[in-house]
Interface confidence: low
């Protein structure tokens, strides 16, 4: 009796189970009662990443430099090319079809996590005792100057955007 289902890595065709082609290979002809499934490797610019019965391999993704993209990992016959963004840019979406510039953290905010090719700058508000007076994609919040360690006193309190201002202690005569 002809099978109605096949084992893993097989497919049903003409009432018989044929082997799927392995990743990196495409189907040339189905198996018959007398012959095995015939598969051929994908060409250099193509891939197939699963056990399959595809008659065509997929083209590797093109990392278009005009969109700010560059190759992070070259594709193989079994894997697609992975694109990432040029320096100073990050992917706009998970599929990384185009890039946008990294954000700066505004004064009062410091960099919690520096941007990468795939993620934007993550900023955090400077907590009490820390400040950032610049708009930067790299600088963290910096601690207020400790006037005491310099034998000075606080003349002006710090804010999340400004450092404390130290001055000399009033000397008693």
């Amino acid at each position: 009796e002809p099978p109605t289902a096949c084992r893993e890595k097989q497919y049903l065709i003409n009432s018989q189970c044929c082997s799927l082609c392995q990743p990196g290979q495409k189907l040339v002809s189905d198996c018959t009662e007398f012959t095995e499934t015939e598969c051929l490797p994908c060409s250099e610019s193509e891939f197939l990443d699963t056990w399959n019965r595809e008659t065509r391999c997929h083209q590797h993704k093109y990392c278009d430099p005009n969109l700010g993209l560059r190759v992070q990992q070259k594709g193989t016959s079994e894997t697609d090319t992975i694109c990432t963004c040029e320096e100073g840019l990050h992917c706009m979406s998970e599929s990384c079809e185009s890039c946008v510039p990294h954000r700066s953290c505004l004064p009062g905010f410091g960099v919690k996590q520096i941007a990468t090719g795939v993620s934007d700058t993550i900023c955090e508000p400077c907590p009490v005792g820390f400040f950032s007076n610049v708009s930067s994609a790299f600088e963290k919040c910096r601690p207020w100057t400790s006037c005491e360690t310099k034998d000075l006193v606080v003349q002006q309190a710090g804010t999340n955007k400004t450092d404390v201002v130290c001055g000399p202690q009033d000397r008693q005569r």
Partner: antibody, heavy 118, light 107 residues
Framework: EVKLQESGPSLVKPSQTLSLTCSVT????????WNWIRKFPGNKLEYMGF???????YYTPSLKSRISITRDTSKNQFYLQLNSVTTEDTATYFC????????????WGQGTTLTVSS | DIQMTQSPSSLSASLGERVSLTCRAS??????LSWIQQKPDGTIKRLIN???TLASGVPKRFSGSRSGSEYSLTINSLESEDFADYYC?????????FGGGTKLEIK
């Protein structure tokens, strides 16, 4: 001085394609991000998308299926195409420049009013 | 999308008066907020960018501030040319989104 000027038809019939041009002077469309924004009769503003210095584009998800933003660097112009328009697309359309996060959207066109009606 | 809730939707004020408009962001926008002005003739002008930076050529009577997720535009001593529509715009994440607007009218 940077100037942006929108141009295009003032009346389009439903189901037709809307094509608008933004002509840029004082800057190059090969640098920065060039945006389309529209304002509906009820005063609601909607961001539509951009074309970047490199030619990459972003479209707001609700318009993705019928919008296209292109450019011609030799003419220093960028374009909006909106397919299958309906009366809901009646609005004033603005083009605008965005260059740096610290500066925000720094230059706007004066807007062009479009009515969709049969 | 990030929702920007702007208030009030309309405001009547007298010349010389001080007024404040606010916008609240539904998600963190890290200070990437602009205030724009639309005059009756339709022209749009940027007043404030990055929450509190005055755009070049904008009079000093305009100022922007932030408190948490709430952003404010204050106009000190209103002048006749200030009567217009005002919108906030978040450009922290795509798609950019706008507040519903405030119509500032002469009392």
């Amino acid at each position: 001085e940077v100037k942006l000027q929108e141009s295009g038809p003032s009346l389009v019939k439903p189901s037709q394609t809307l094509s608008l041009t933004c002509s840029v002077t004082g800057d190059s469309v090969s640098s920065g991000y060039w945006n389309w924004i529209r304002k509906f009769p009820g005063n609601k503003l909607e961001y539509m998308g951009f074309i970047s210095y490199s030619g990459s584009t972003y479209y707001t998800p609700s318009l993705k299926s019928r919008i296209s933003i292109t450019r011609d660097t030799s003419k220093n112009q960028f374009y909006l195409q909106l397919n299958s328009v309906t009366t809901e697309d009646t609005a004033t359309y603005f083009c605008a420049r965005f260059r740096r996060y610290d500066d925000g959207v720094d230059y706007w066109g004066q807007g062009t009013t479009l009515t969709v009606s049969s | 999308d990030i929702q920007m809730t702007q208030s009030p939707s309309s405001l009547s004020a007298s010349l010389g008066e001080r007024v404040s408009l606010t916008c609240r962001a539904s998600h963190e926008i890290s200070g990437y907020l602009s205030w724009i002005q639309q005059k009756p003739d339709g022209t749009i002008k940027r007043l404030i960018n990055a929450a509190s930076t005055l755009a070049s050529g904008v009079p000093k009577r305009f100022s922007g501030s932030r408190s948490g997720s709430e952003y404010s535009l204050t106009i000190n001593s209103l002048e006749s040319e200030d009567f217009a529509d005002y919108y906030c715009l978040q450009y922290s994440s795509y798609p950019w989104t706008f507040g519903g607007g405030t119509k500032l009218e002469i009392k």
